[in-house]
């Protein structure tokens, strides 16, 4: 006989980095006829709903107008039917960005490359971190941890075109709280016309579109649960 | 600029009732879901109850669940608590809070922890002794 329902999906609408003072919507997506979700946050009851009528709502949304470093964190989410309570959702990381300073990311030998050339992206921010985010633009949300007292170095080896794109980077003063982003730094790496073809550029948004954080394409990650719960999981551990 | 008012706080015997009000000014009080703490003598802050917008969801912390019954007036921007089958335990200050932001909660969402509220009551002293 079945104990636990299961778990229901949780993801961040529009993302799961957030601007602090900006608004995020965290959603949960269980199962029609649920009488009840909790959202918790760090491990304890964070908030409640009881969607009306049940039968109709498999999804809900829990509001957070003002993001700052107090909500920024761990969440999940659970769902009851009848008296029987699904397993927890995977886990959402809760980031929160533009926090006091904006790092500088360079790139050596330079932005234009030939394939198989070796690369190294720098990022250097002045004030007190040891925690550095490499993050390219589109579809996956390519993202590189590195370590440093006021610059990182993140080594990408020798480059394929498939490495092309947009990067940028954070400084991370704790697991959920990050800087302002750098500017952004576009890698050129010209190769044979077949190798081209192979790997083409991830797509990427317009640089006035990074404010909201949107590095999926508006079909992409957003709305595939199980990628979203696996990047979210694991783009801190 | 928001504020917060709780009244009809005092003084009661252990079994005795009162009921709280909170009003609120300053923010549109009929699309925020509220919440009542409070932070008995030498200890912390501790969800009481919370209550949706609309009134159609209701939460209790399991130490109040059936003698205190929260409920709101839109009309009057007010919320209140009742408390019934008071307990020397409940002796406490009681804080209303208001969630932030705008219209955008769901109709039938509570919050049950403090982070998530953004204004708070002066609040109002409870004492539970015979």
């Known amino acids: 006989q079945q104990q636990t329902l299961p778990k229901p999906f949780i993801w961040a609408e529009p993302h799961f980095m957030v601007p602090k003072e900006k608004q995020v919507t965290i959603c949960c997506q269980g199962n029609y006829g649920a009488v009840e979700y909790q959202l918790h946050f760090e491990g304890s009851l964070f908030a409640v709903d009881r969607p009306k009528p049940p039968e109709r709502i498999n999804k809900v949304q829990f509001y957070i107008p003002d993001m700052n470093s107090r909500m920024a964190g761990q969440y999940s989410c659970i769902y009851r039917v009848g008296e029987l309570w699904s397993e927890p959702s995977n886990l959402l990381d809760l980031v929160v960005t533009e926090m006091y300073d904006t790092p500088t990311l360079s790139v050596h030998p330079g932005p234009e490359v030939i394939s198989g050339e070796k690369v190294t992206f720098y990022c250097r921010l002045d004030t007190a971190t040891s925690m550095f985010l490499l993050l390219k633009e589109g579809r996956s949300s390519h993202v590189q941890r590195g370590y440093g007292k006021v610059q990182a170095e993140f080594p990408l080896g020798p480059v394929t075109t498939a490495h092309r794109g947009t990067y940028r980077c954070f400084g991370s003063y704790n697991n959920h709280a990050w800087s302002f982003p750098s500017e952004p730094v576009k890698l050129l790496v010209t190769g044979d016309i077949e190798n081209t073809s192979l790997a083409p550029e991830d797509p990427t948004f317009p640089a006035d579109t990074w404010g909201t954080y949107l590095l999926t394409t508006e079909t992409g990650l957003q709305k595939d649960h199980a990628l979203w719960d696996h990047t979210a999981q694991n783009l801190l551990r | 600029e928001v504020q917060l008012v709780e009244s009809g706080g005092g003084l009661v015997q252990p079994g005795g009732s009162l009921r709280l009000s909170c009003a609120v000014s300053g923010r549109t009080f009929s699309r925020l879901p509220m919440g009542w703490f409070r932070q008995a003598p030498g200890k912390g802050l501790e969800f009481v109850a919370a209550?949706?917008?609309?009134?159609?969801?209701?939460y209790y912390a399991d130490s109040v669940k059936g003698r205190f019954t929260i409920s709101r007036d839109n009309s009057k921007n007010t919320a209140y608590l009742q408390m019934n089958s008071l307990r020397a335990e409940d002796t406490a200050v009681y804080y209303c809070?208001?969630?932030?932001?705008?219209?955008?909660?769901?109709?039938?969402?509570?919050?049950?922890?403090?982070?998530?509220?953004?204004?708070w009551g002066q609040g109002t002293l409870v004492t539970v002794s015979s």
């Open positions: 809070a208001a969630v932030g932001g705008s219209l955008d909660y769901s109709a039938t969402v509570v919050y049950t922890a403090a982070r998530a509220y953004a204004d």
């Open positions: 209550i949706s917008w609309s009134s159609s969801t209701t």
